[in-house]
C-alpha cells in the first residue's frame, strides 16, 4: 500500500513538475525590465526563450518572435535545448510511468516489469528535472552577468552623464516557475525510484528446500512469507533492483516533508 502511494505520489508530483517545465518554457517572462532605481518608463519590456514583448502603459502589448536561429546567443540556444530535452524526457517518463503504476493492470504484466518501468521513469524524471534546473540556472547566470555589465555601462560616457537609458533586465516569473517545476520533477523522480525498491520482488537468501515426510509432502520456504505477501503469488524471484542488504524488519523509507532536493 505504501509503495503504491509513493509511486502514485511520485507520478502526480512529476506530472505537475513537467507541466510547470512546459509552462516555463512557453512563458514570455524569462527576463523582465528592471524597474528598481531606474527612471519610470511608460513602457515595460520582457523577454522569453522564443520572443520578446513590450507592454505599453496604454495596455497595448506587442510581441516579436526571434525569427533567426544563427543570430541568437549560444547560451540562449543552450537553454532552449536543455528545456526541450527536459520536456521530451519528462513526457516519455510520464508515458512509461502510466504503464508502471501499480493501480493500473495491463494484461499479465509482472511486478518485475513494473519495477523496471518505475525505475526507468524515475531516472527520466530526475534527468528531466535536472535539465530544467540547469537551463533556468544558465539563463539566470546570463542575466546576472548582463545586469552588472549594463549597470557599469550606465555610468560611463561623456563626463559620467547618462546619455541614453540602458534597459536592464532582471529575473522574470518563468525562472521561478522553472526552478520549482524542475525541483518537483526531480522529487517525483526520486519518489519513483524509491517506489521501485518496494515493487522489486526480493531474492531470498536461501533456496527453497523440500522436506519429504512420510504420508504427505510439505514445501517450506524460509523467508518466503514476506516475499509473497502484498503482491499476489510470486513465482519468479528475479532480482530487479538491489539496494543493498536489508534486514527482515527494515521499513521502506520515504521522503519526509523535510527532504528537499
Amino acid at each position: 500500500m505504501a509503495v503504491t502511494a509513493c509511486q502514485g505520489l511520485g507520478f502526480v508530483v512529476s506530472l505537475i513538475g513537467i507541466a510547470g517545465i512546459i509552462a516555463a518554457t512557453c512563458m514570455d517572462q524569462w527576463s523582465t525590465q528592471d524597474l528598481y532605481n531606474n527612471p519610470v518608463t511608460a513602457v515595460f519590456n520582457y523577454q522569453g526563450l522564443w520572443r520578446s514583448c513590450v507592454r505599453e502603459s496604454s495596455g497595448f502589448t506587442e510581441c516579436r518572435g526571434y525569427f533567426t536561429l544563427l543570430g541568437l546567443p549560444a547560451m540562449l540556444q543552450a537553454v532552449r535545448a536543455l528545456m526541450i530535452v527536459g520536456i521530451v524526457l519528462g513526457a516519455i517518463g510520464l508515458l512509461v510511468s502510466i504503464f508502471a503504476l501499480k493501480c493500473i493492470r495491463i494484461g499479465s504484466m509482472e511486478d518485475s516489469a513494473k519495477a523496471n518501468m518505475t525505475l526507468t521513469s524515475g531516472i527520466m524524471f530526475i534527468v528531466s528535472g535536472l535539465c530544467a534546473i540547469a537551463g533556468v540556472s544558465v539563463f539566470a547566470n546570463m542575466l546576472v552577468t548582463n545586469f552588472w555589465m549594463s549597470t557599469a555601462n550606465m555610468y560611463t560616457g561623456m563626463g559620467g552623464m547618462v546619455q541614453t537609458v540602458q534597459t536592464r533586465y532582471t529575473f522574470g516569473a518563468a525562472l521561478f516557475v522553472g526552478w520549482v517545476a524542475g525541483g518537483l520533477t526531480l522529487i517525483g523522480g526520486v519518489m519513483m525510484c524509491i517506489a521501485c525498491r518496494g515493487l522489486a520482488p526480493e531474492e531470498t537468501n536461501y533456496k527453497a528446500v523440500s522436506y519429504h515426510a512420510s504420508g504427505h509432502s510439505v514445501a517450506y520456504k524460509p523467508g518466503g512469507f514476506k516475499a509473497s505477501t502484498g503482491f499476489g503469488s510470486n513465482t519468479k524471484n528475479k532480482k530487479i533492483y538491489d539496494g543493498g542488504a536489508r534486514t527482515e524488519d527494515e521499513v521502506q523509507s520515504y521522503p519526509s516533508k523535510h527532504d528537499y532536493v
Epitope: P39, V40, V54, S58, G59, V165
Partner: antibody, heavy 118, light 113 residues
Framework: EVQLQQSGREVVRPGTSVKVSCKPS????????IDWVKQRPGQGLEWIGG????????VYNERFKDKATLTADKSSSSANMQLSSLTSDDSAVYFC???????????WGQGTLVTVSA | DIVMTQSPSSLTVTAGQKVTMSCKSS????????????LTWYQQKPGQPPKLLIY???TRESGVPDRFTGSGSGKDFTLTISSVQAEDLAVFYC?????????FGAGTKLELK
Amino acid sequence: EVQLQQSGREVVRPGTSVKVSCKPSGYAFTNYLIDWVKQRPGQGLEWIGGINPGSGDTVYNERFKDKATLTADKSSSSANMQLSSLTSDDSAVYFCARRVRGNSFDSWGQGTLVTVSA
Amino acid sequence: DIVMTQSPSSLTVTAGQKVTMSCKSSQSLLNSGNQKNYLTWYQQKPGQPPKLLIYWASTRESGVPDRFTGSGSGKDFTLTISSVQAEDLAVFYCQNNYFYPLTFGAGTKLELK
C-alpha cells in the same frame, strides 16, 4: 465614433475645489487609460496624470500630485478630476484624452475652462 | 523630467511650401525592446483640442494626410509637411511618451505669409 464629452466651464473662488468630468463614448470605457492635460491661455500643454478606469490605478506628474485627484466611476462610465486649493495659476483649459498605442492620445475632450477668480 | 525642445518657435510659410520642424529630447526615447521611438506629434488649431498626427515617431495616424511625415530616432526628431495647405496652420507639439512624466514641447506655430 469615439467621443469624450467634458463638463462645462467653471468659475470658482481661490482656495476652493472643482471637479471636472469626462464621459467617453463609442468604446469600452475600462479598456483604455484616460489622461488629463492642462493648457493655460496662450501656453503649451502640460500632462497632469492618467487613470486606468478598469483598475483605478493612477499615475501623476509630481507637480500635480497635491493638486489633482483622478477617479473613475465605472457605473456612469466617466472619469473625473478634482482640483483642490485653487489659485489663479490653476486657471486653464483642462482636457481629458484617451491613451492608445504608442502611449499617444488619439481622442480628446473639447476641454473645460476653469477660471479661478475672487 | 525629460525636456522637449522644439524649434523654431514659429514658422511663416506660403501655401505649397515644404516645411520641417525639429524636436529634441533630453534623453533617448528609443525603446530597445521593440526598437520604437516613443515620440508623438500633435496639431492644435485655435479653440480646438490637439489632434494626433504621428506616433512612434514615424507612424501616421489613420486619416492623417500623407503630406505629414515624422522621422528621427533617439533624441532628434523631425516633422515634415511636404506641401503646406491653408488648413495646416496651427501649433504643432511633440510629446515624450516614454518617460514619466509625459512631457510636451513648447510648440512650433505655423503661420501663413
